[in-house]
Interface confidence: low
């Protein structure tokens, strides 16, 4: 029952002698598993026996009998789905029909597959796109209706026998739908590939040649052109004739139109392969090419540079750069249209020829003010000498020159004077626009370049000015030489180095920081009394009476300056001690008597000691000795001693008389 057997496999398989054939195959037997399989070669149905006759290439039966062909022919299928076969190697006489005789428990089926085995490896087939254009990527396909697991092959692409550099992608198909090997090559053909032979070569696994297919490339491209010119160097003089010829070296398809271009612009009414230029002018110099078009597009030849030669035109001068800064470098360029280029130049400065300058450029490495002026040139080539053009002006700029600071006042200048200075210069380009002064001060500038210093200071030593245009030029500083009275006068003790004690030798110095003029006189004074006219005041043996307030004065021709008062202090031991008594040296008993120890001392007495008429020290140490109530027994002579850091002094005896009171006398 045919409806129960469904087969899928390629209709025809292709191979060659010695290769192999792999037959992908699937089937479906709906009534159960396969029980018997026989592979026939060219089976014929025998009506008498109701069986198929033919060569049995493979047999699989219940009893397991297998012919010797089994080694070459393999059934790789199973009992219900797969009916794949392999013949390895395959022979020429295997061509024809293969019959797959399938039997299940209740059903039988004969499936036929065509096998085409050639004597030699058959060639692959190259497939090209319908149109190939230069520089457009195309895919070349090489297809071979063969693939077999037991017989590896490779497809190689060659261009004129040279392996193509581009990487090819090879794919194989061994399916029930198709069996093939395919190589695809992506390739961007150039116009020069037109007409070239591309080969797809079939090789075995070792790279041995088996067969090939070749095609000739038909690459559509714009016309490829050659331009020829007479004269061949394309160099002519005004009035000469020029002929240009355009040759098409390749065009696919054939060209349709021709045109000529000069400097990229189409020339009207020039539509032949020859361009004739008669009596050329210099304006016809330029780049010429021919353009030929076909259906792909326009193709252009290389450019021919036509040079029409003529004598130099009136020249102009270009200055790099004007205005120029003194000391910088300047380049002059003589510009003159000429063909050929000028070979000799003559240069002029303010109308006078510049000796030794024959180049297109004049380079002055260090510009000076005298270089300013008009520069012009004349160019010369083999066809003649040009005319001198209008020239160009060089402006040389420089800072103000010979700047000086001038004092306008009569000399000498005294502290407190008003001083006027002016800033002068010799020349400047551009003009001076401002002035600067050093050092800076809150000074007046009544007019440009004039400085007025009111109440000039003693320490205004030097002033410098700068005259400025784009740059500032500074003058050398000018000394004001301001005269002033001596400054910072002060008294300084030279000796002794420590405090002054009575009897010491003492020297005082009159110091000052500065004086202009330098010649000075000194004066020493104490309480308005002149003491000396030297810079030093000396005491051989100082006494306490010399203590006091001292000043020194220093004079010059401008004025006199006094020091601050300086206090001279003399240290001495207590002296001129005496004991004074209060209310007197005669006191009535019972009253109070106060004895005071008076002295002269520097520093003041720090410690007192009291003694009686027996030279016995009393237990009292203050300046005052208070007796209260006073007794008759207190009568007697007393003296005191004073002590300071310098020494001690004692008083003479003083007598206290204590007399009886009337009450005491009354009781007696």
């Amino acid at each position: 029952d045919s409806s129960k057997w469904v087969f899928e496999h390629p209709e025809t398989l292709y191979a060659w002698e010695g290769a192999c054939v792999w037959i992908p195959c699937t089937y479906r037997a709906l009534d159960g598993d396969l029980e018997s399989f026989i592979l026939f070669h060219n089976p014929e149905y025998n009506k008498n026996t109701s069986k198929f006759d033919g060569t049995r290439l493979y047999e699989s039966t219940k009893d397991g009998k297998v012919p010797s062909e089994q080694k070459r022919v393999q059934f790789l299928g199973d009992k219900n789905k797969n009916c794949t076969l392999s013949i390895h190697p395959v022979h020429l006489n295997d061509s024809g029909q293969l019959g797959l005789r399938m039997e299940s428990k209740t059903e039988k089926w004969m499936e036929r597959i065509h096998l085409n085995v050639s004597e030699r490896p058959f060639p692959p087939h190259i497939q090209l796109p319908p149109e190939i254009q230069e520089s457009q990527e195309v895919t070349l396909t090489c297809l071979l209706n063969f693939s077999c697991y037991g017989y590896p092959i490779q497809l190689q692409w060659l261009l004129e026998g040279v392996p193509m550099r581009q990487a090819a992608v090879t794919s194989t198909s061994l399916t029930i739908k198709s069996v093939f090997t395919r190589s695809e090559l992506k390739f961007s053909p150039q116009w020069s590939h037109h007409g070239k032979i591309v080969t797809c070569q079939l090789q075995d696994a070792d790279g041995k040649f088996l067969s090939n297919d070749t095609v000739q490339l038909n690459v559509k491209h714009t016309p490829k052109l050659e331009i020829k010119v007479t004269p061949s160097d394309a160099i002519v003089r005004e009035g000469d004739s020029v002929t240009m010829t355009c040759e098409v070296s390749s065009s696919n398809p054939e060209y349709t139109t021709v045109s000529w271009l000069k400097d990229g612009t189409s020339l009207k009414k020039q539509n032949t392969f020859t361009l004739n230029l008669r009596e050329v002018t210099k304006d016809q110099s330029g780049k010429y090419c021919c353009q030929v078009s076909n259906d792909v597009g326009p193709g252009r030849s290389e450019e021919v540079f036509l040079q029409v030669q003529y004598a130099p035109e009136p020249s102009t001068v270009q200055i790099l750069h004007s205005p120029a800064v003194e000391g910088s470098q300047v380049e002059f360029l003589c510009m003159s249209l000429a063909n050929p280029l000028p070979t000799n130049y003559t240069w002029y400065h303010n109308g006078k020829e510049m000796q030794g300058r024959t180049e297109e450029k004049v380079h002055i490495p260090k510009i000076l003010p005298w270089h300013a002026g008009t520069y012009s040139c004349v160019a010369e080539n083999i066809l003649g000498t040009g005319q001198r053009g209008p020239g160009a002006e060089l402006d040389v700029q420089y800072p103000p020159k010979k700047v000086t600071t001038v004092i306008q006042n009569p000399m000498p200048i005294r502290e407190g004077d008003t001083v006027t200075l002016s800033c002068n210069y010799n020349s400047s380009n551009p003009s001076v626009t401002r002035y600067e002064w050093k050092p800076h001060g809150a000074w007046e500038e009544p007019s440009l370049g004039v400085l007025k210093i009111q109440n000039v200071g003693w320490d205004n030593t030097t002033i410098a000015c700068a005259a400025c245009n784009s740059w500032c030029s500074w003058a050398s500083p000018v000394a004001l030489n301001v005269q002033y009275a001596p400054r910072d006068v002060r008294v300084r003790k030279i000796k002794p180095l420590s405090e002054i004690h009575s009897g010491n030798s003492v020297s005082l110095q009159c110091d000052f920081s500065s004086s202009h003029p330098k010649e000075v006189q000194f004066f020493w004074e104490k309480n308005g009394r002149l003491l000396g006219k030297e810079s030093q005041l000396n005491f051989d043996s100082i006494s306490p009476e010399d203590a006091g307030s001292y000043s020194c004065w220093v004079n010059n021709s401008i004025g006199q300056t006094a020091s601050k008062a300086w206090t001279l202090e003399v240290l001495y031991a207590p002296r001129r001690l005496r004991v004074s008594m209060s209310p007197g040296d005669q006191v009535m008993e019972g009253k109070s008597a106060t004895l005071t120890c008076e002295s002269d001392a520097n520093p003041p007495v720090s410690h007192y000691t009291w003694f009686d008429w027996n030279n016995q020290s009393l237990p009292y140490h203050s300046q005052k000795l208070r007796l209260e109530p006073v007794k008759v027994q207190h009568s007697g002579a007393y003296w005191c001693q004073g002590t300071n850091s310098v020494g001690k002094g004692r008083s003479p005896l003083s007598t206290l008389t204590v007399y009886y009171s009337p009450e005491t006398i009354g009781r007696r």
Epitope: E160, V162, S192, K196, I197, K224, E226, E247, S249, S250
Partner: nanobody, 114 residues
């Protein structure tokens, strides 16, 4: 247009040698791959060998391998075919041309007698 002029053919005995020359006009000669072809009476024109534009690569048909050598001189716009160990089956009119072909020249007759 470009012109191709072949020369150097003649009658030679089997085993002998000949050197064919092909002069090409046109400034693009040095850009072109050049090929030598031959056509025997009653047969299709077959390609004998190819040389690329700078002369660095050549390929020959299986029938002439090891016997024929192609070379070129771009300064002279000329391509050469050195033929050694000639056989009677090499008898043909020999042509040179570019790839792709320019208009064909007249060719030069080579006859190899046994």
């Amino acid at each position: 247009q470009v012109q191709l002029v072949e020369s150097g053919g003649g009658l030679v005995q089997a085993g002998g040698s000949l050197r064919l020359s092909c002069a090409a006009s046109g400034s693009t000669f040095s850009l072109k791959a050049m090929a030598w072809y031959r056509q025997a009476p009653g047969k299709q024109r077959e390609r004998v060998g190819v040389i690329n534009s700078d002369g660095s690569y050549t390929t020959d048909a299986a029938s002439v391998q090891g016997r024929f050598t192609i070379s070129r001189d771009n300064a002279k716009n000329t391509v050469y075919l050195q033929m050694n160990s000639l056989k009677p089956e090499d008898t043909a009119v020999y042509y040179c041309n570019t790839m792709p072909p320019w208009p064909w020249g007249q060719g030069t007759q080579v006859t190899v007698s046994s």
